[in-house]
């Protein structure tokens, strides 16, 4: 039979009976929850008939009394079998056993779910000696129960290497539903279905779930936990939560925001980190990612010169590290630069355009049509050339550098001359007769010295030779010319 005790106005007496300190009688539930102490009486079940020691684990003593009568088997008296109470309430339960006085050093230990309870637990053992037996009452109390206190509690006593085990006392802590799985924030594609999960447990069970979207109940009738909500798609951000209900009341999950993935906002603060003649290093601050990670970015570059054809160069790069070196640009040119980035939904608009300029560079080509001839009367070598095309000067010409190398039997010396930017001719003194003079010319800007022209060689004869002719830069691909006079 199951005996029940529900809340009453007066507390249950603890251990009324013959022993001082209140030893229980067999028919009294082993639970005292006096209202004055802040405890609420709880629901209890006693699984065995009152008055009978349990038949579980008993020790039959081998010792006999003076009259040689065998001692009765030792066993814990039956106790309340099931205590149901609310979270944060207090509870006290106990085991009792009568032990013949011939046994010494009897100790009772408490165990929960197969593990011994040591240390900080509030367990008290009281002894009530009589002529032949000692009543031992072991009490266990919890001042404010939590869910973790749920479980099966037993007492153990060792006598003569025999272990006596009490019936279990099941503690069931009931409270509001407790979430084991709550909905998670998500970023979703517009108008695409997705799932949210909510799970809560008691006791008491069952736990029923209601879903709430933007303060409106999605399901008007409860669903048993766990519950999966299929949201049929969203067109704008929404907040979801779930309510878990049981007989104790209602717990509401955290509200989670579900965002709609969108194209990113345009990058901001595009800035020039460094400029060279042919490259510009830019950085940018990414815009809002539209709830979807950036995949890559596109740098758009157009010449700012109003006379340019307006074509746009596009450079693709990874989204990180928000830095890109734009190459293959013209020197001393103005450019408009914009940045756009994309996520899985699409491309952002282009950032505000910024103006950037490349610096002067060294010319990219050498002077053209270099010719060299000997002016014997003045003992000079005359050099003429054409300046490189303006586009390839990569800056403002400040002049030219002439390299002339004189070679005769076993001797070689190189000399360098600087020439102002206005001319396209130069005269150098003959350094050695009966020698070959090799001439190369490079254009110079503030950005540096450009490449030298292909070498032009002229033979300078010993004094008194009359015949001579100019030497000039060869057509591309021909071998270096040598003029023999």
């Amino acid at each position: 039979a199951i005996t029940e005790a529900r809340e009453e106005a007066k507390p249950y007496p603890l251990f009324p009976g013959p022993f001082p300190g209140s030893l229980q009688t067999d028919h009294t539930p082993l639970l005292s929850l006096p209202h004055a102490s802040g405890y609420q009486p709880a629901l209890m079940f006693s699984p065995t008939q009152p008055g009978r020691p349990h038949t579980g684990n008993v020790a039959i003593p081998q010792v006999t009394s003076v009259e040689s009568k065998p001692l009765p088997p030792l066993a814990f008296k039956h106790t309340v079998g099931h205590i149901i109470l609310s979270e944060h309430k207090g509870v006290k339960f106990n085991c009792s056993i009568s032990v013949p006085n011939i046994y010494q050093d009897t100790t009772i230990s408490w165990w929960k779910d197969g593990k011994e309870l040591l240390g900080a637990h509030h367990a008290i053992t009281q002894f009530y000696p009589d002529d032949e037996v000692t009543a031992i009452i072991a009490s266990f109390s919890i001042t404010s129960v939590q869910r973790s206190d749920n479980g099966s509690y037993i007492c153990k006593m060792k006598i003569n290497n025999e272990e006596i085990v009490s019936d279990p006392i099941y503690i069931e802590v009931q409270g509001l539903p407790h979430f084991t799985k709550q909905p998670e924030s998500m970023n979703v594609t517009r108008n695409t279905a997705f799932n949210l999960t909510c799970q809560a447990v008691g006791p008491p069970e069952p736990v029923n779930i209601f879903w709430v979207q933007n303060s409106s109940r999605v399901n008007e009738q409860p669903e048993k936990s766990p519950s999966v909500l299929t949201v049929p798609g969203l067109t704008e951000m929404a907040v979801f939560s779930c309510e878990a209900h049981n007989d104790k009341g209602l717990t509401v999950s955290k509200g989670v925001q579900i965002n709609i993935k969108a194209i990113p906002s345009p990058p901001t603060e595009v800035s020039i980190r460094n400029s060279t003649a042919h490259s510009i290093l830019i950085s940018w601050v990414p815009g809002f990612d539209g709830y979807s990670p950036f995949r890559n970015c596109s740098i758009q570059v157009k010449e700012a010169d109003p006379l340019s054809n307006g074509s746009v160069m596009i450079f693709n790069t990874s989204a990180l590290p928000h830095l890109y070196q734009i190459k293959q640009l013209q020197a001393l040119a103005n450019y408009s630069i914009g940045v756009s980035c994309m996520n899985e939904i699409g491309w952002s608009a282009v950032s505000p355009w910024i103006l950037a300029s490349t610096t002067e560079g060294a010319p990219s080509v050498a002077p053209l049509n270099v010719t060299v001839f000997l002016n014997e009367s003045s003992d000079n070598v005359d050099i003429r050339w054409m300046k490189p095309p303006t586009k390839q000067q990569d800056g403002e010409l400040v002049g030219y550098r002439i390299s002339h190398v004189w070679q005769s039997a076993g001797i070689s010396k190189e000399l360098l001359e600087e020439v102002g930017q206005n001319g396209s001719r130069a005269r150098i003194s003959v350094q050695v007769h009966n020698a070959t003079c090799t001439v190369r010319i490079a254009a110079v800007t503030r950005g540096g010295v450009g490449p030298f022209s292909d070498p032009v060689k002229i033979f300078i004869p010993a004094h008194g030779w009359v015949d001579y002719a100019p030497s000039s830069t060869p057509a591309p691909g021909n071998a270096d010319p040598v003029l023999i006079i």
Epitope: Q213, N214, S216, V218, N219, E220, Q221, P232, G233, T235
Partner: antibody
Framework: QIQLVQSGSELKKPGASVKVSCKAS????????MNWVRQAPGQGLEWMGW????????TYADDFKGRFVFSLDTSVSTAYLQISSLKAEDTAVYYC???????????WGQGTLVTVSS | EIVLTQSPDFQSVTPKEKVTITCRAS?????MHWYQQKPDQSPKLLIK???NLASGVPSRFSGSGSGTDFTLTINSLEAEDAATYYC?????????FGQGTKLEIK
């Protein structure tokens, strides 16, 4: 398959009462709320309210508070609509319909015509 | 309560034509459902939650919209589509229906 079968047409005099039934089959009756929708002759659809088949709690739209009562007999998976003190303007087809998430009416009864005429 | 206004009230169209019915809510709603009702029949769910086709509904029907403006589109109308169409909102109690749009086939 899911079916909602309603009771037959009724002809009533003003002041009388009528009780329309809606028997559900093909699903667990207590899992989904039961709604009632009215359609007067030649008119559109009007949501009257619903009854929670799990708790038995009814909810009435403002225009249907008072003379209209929703009830259940879960043992036979049936919902009822009772209208008392009938008036001529109660003449309409009354539909029962189930909904789940997001209150779309996936299943409808065939409708019950209630005619109130002296 | 949220008032739903459908337009047009009535439309006469020829087969294969594209038809658009709009439903405007007096304030923002989360979802719009659409129903088709033929004479002497119960309403039938066509579109649930704004844009999701109910089972067994031909793909020529589609729904779209958000906030206060929603649309039911029938691409390439067929003779069997002659019916009255109703929108119904979810998001604010009480649930409300539009007044209906009657579609006649020429």
């Amino acid at each position: 398959q899911i079916q909602l079968v309603q009771s037959g047409s009724e002809l009533k005099k003003p002041g009388a009462s009528v009780k329309v039934s809606c028997k559900a089959s093909g699903y667990t009756f207590t899992n989904y709320g039961m709604n009632w929708v009215r359609q007067a002759p030649g008119q559109g659809l009007e949501w009257m309210g619903w009854i929670n088949t799990y708790t038995g709690e009814p909810t009435y739209a403002d225009d249907f508070k008072g003379r209209f009562v929703f009830s259940l007999d879960t043992s036979v998976s049936t919902a009822y609509l009772q209208i008392s003190s009938l008036k001529a303007e109660d003449t309409a087809v009354y539909y029962c319909a189930t909904y789940g998430h997001y209150a779309w009416f996936a299943y409808w009864g065939q409708g019950t015509l209630v005619t109130v005429s002296s | 309560e949220i008032v739903l206004t459908q337009s047009p009230d009535f439309q006469s169209v020829t087969p294969k034509e594209k038809v658009t019915i709009t439903c405007r809510a007096s304030s923002s709603v989360s979802y719009m459902h659409w129903y088709q009702q033929k004479p002497d029949q119960s309403p039938k769910l066509l579109i649930k939650a704004t844009s999701n086709l109910a089972s067994g509904v031909p793909s020529r029907f589609s729904g779209s919209g958000s906030g206060t403006d929603f649309t039911l589109t029938i691409n390439s109308l067929e003779a069997e589509d002659a019916a009255t169409y109703y929108c119904q909102q979810w998001g604010t109690k009480p649930l409300t229906f539009g007044q209906g749009t009657k579609l006649e086939i020429k």
